[in-house]
Amino acid sequence: LIIGFGISGRHSITVTTVASAGNIGEDGILSCTFEPDIKLSDIVIQWLKEGVLGLVHEFKEGKDELSEQDEMFRGRTAVFADQVIVGNASLRLKNVQLTDAGTYKCYIITSKGKGNANLEYKTGAFSMPEVNVDYNASSETLRCEAPRWFPQPTVVWASQVDQGANFSEVSNTSFELNSENVTMKVVSVLYNVTINNTYSCMIENDIAKATGDIKVTESEIKRRSHLQLLNSKAS
């Protein structure tokens, strides 16, 4: 969480941003809130990015003002116009690109004063893993697959029964480049699996951590998946 104070003579307002991550090819949110004003026409929101010549987005007098917008963001940005009046300056970024990563500034002017806060935005690819029993294998085998990751993650297997055990000798992980030549499909196979145990396939890079669990008993198979973004810090 980053909280910025703007000082304009005696007038300052608090602006708060939250560091976040964008999943490339999908839509992302750059989060920013501020002390609201009673008049929408008095609020100016400007989003900037370090190293970019033009603005990322500008909203003033109740509407978008995009004459100074940088071409790399053209047609890809929007604020939540109906929420600006209550202090939401968050930016929706469509079709997140790898190059969207970097330092952003949310800059706010209201009748009360001005303020700004920076936001670190990471970009990559992350997806939920699915763990299945590989019935085609010669021995009891589990197969963990996740369709899109970038940068290349690490994959670690764990088990509820053998806590702390190192499964690197009995597992094999491969990364297959997807058709867009950036993201990769992650496939990890775990051999010599025992029944009545819960196994976890943990995939992690510097942006996200995802876990796929599978519980195999003689009568049923239970699965559960979980994904967590790693860098959600507020400013």
Partner: antibody, heavy 120, light 107 residues
């Protein structure tokens, strides 16, 4: 220490060419846009050109458009200004400058300048 | 292009004086304004950004105010080191433009 160091200035005849360099140190060069600003003898400051951190986007003053080209090599932490078809009115001290989000895109770091003289 | 007009072009003052320099933009630039100090043979030095924010390391006798089209730089008590030329500059749009400068000289 954050530093910008220009080089490549000198005496050139009208119609000639010159390439200025600006070596950056002390900061992550590729993260920042960069600009060239010039100052004719006894005159004020004039912005010349800017380039984005990636090098993919550029902007020029009308007075140099079509004659000057700004570029950068992020692997060498160096900014360039290729000046062609030089005129007497291009005579100036040329500064490279770094704008920053921290200073709302004002130029917080400047080089010491390099003198370009266009004369026959 | 946004034109930046500074006044006066020359200002004679004494140590201890309160000095005010004005900068006017040809269209609204919100608070996208910076002030620089330049001494002969040296590169400009950033004093004020965002119209009123003091750059780190700059003495507090320097202050900036204004928004929209009218801006001022004030030196509350002129010191010997302050005799120099001062420029305003807009960062609202390209091309970036500077004011013509104000030379503060000893009376």
């Amino acid at each position: 220490e954050v530093q910008l160091l220009e080089s490549g200035g000198g005496l050139v005849q009208p119609g000639g060419s010159l390439r200025l360099s600006c070596a950056a140190s002390g900061f992550t060069f590729s993260s920042y846009a960069m600009s060239w600003v010039r100052q004719a003898p006894g005159k004020g400051l004039e912005w010349v050109s800017a380039i984005s951190g990636s090098g993919g986007s550029t902007s020029y003053a009308d007075s140099v458009k079509g004659r000057f080209t700004i570029s950068r090599d992020n692997s060498k932490n160096t900014l360039y200004l290729q000046m062609n078809s030089l005129r007497a009115e291009d005579t100036a001290v040329y500064y490279c400058a770094k704008p920053s989000l921290a200073t709302m895109l004002a130029f917080d770091i400047w080089g010491q300048g390099t003198m370009v003289t266009v004369s026959s | 292009d946004i034109q930046m007009t500074q006044s006066p072009s020359t200002l004679s003052a004494s140590v201890g004086d309160r000095v005010t320099i004005t900068c006017r933009a040809s269209q609204s630039i919100s608070s996208w304004l910076a002030w620089y100090q330049q001494k002969p043979g040296k590169a400009p030095k950033l004093l004020i950004y965002d119209a009123s924010s003091l750059e780190s390391g700059v003495p507090s006798r320097f202050s900036g105010s204004g928004s929209g089209t009218e801006f001022t730089l004030t030196i509350s008590s002129l010191q010997p080191d302050d005799f120099a030329t001062y420029y305003c500059q807009q960062s609202k749009s390209y091309p970036r433009t500077f004011g013509g400068g104000t030379k503060v000289e000893i009376k």
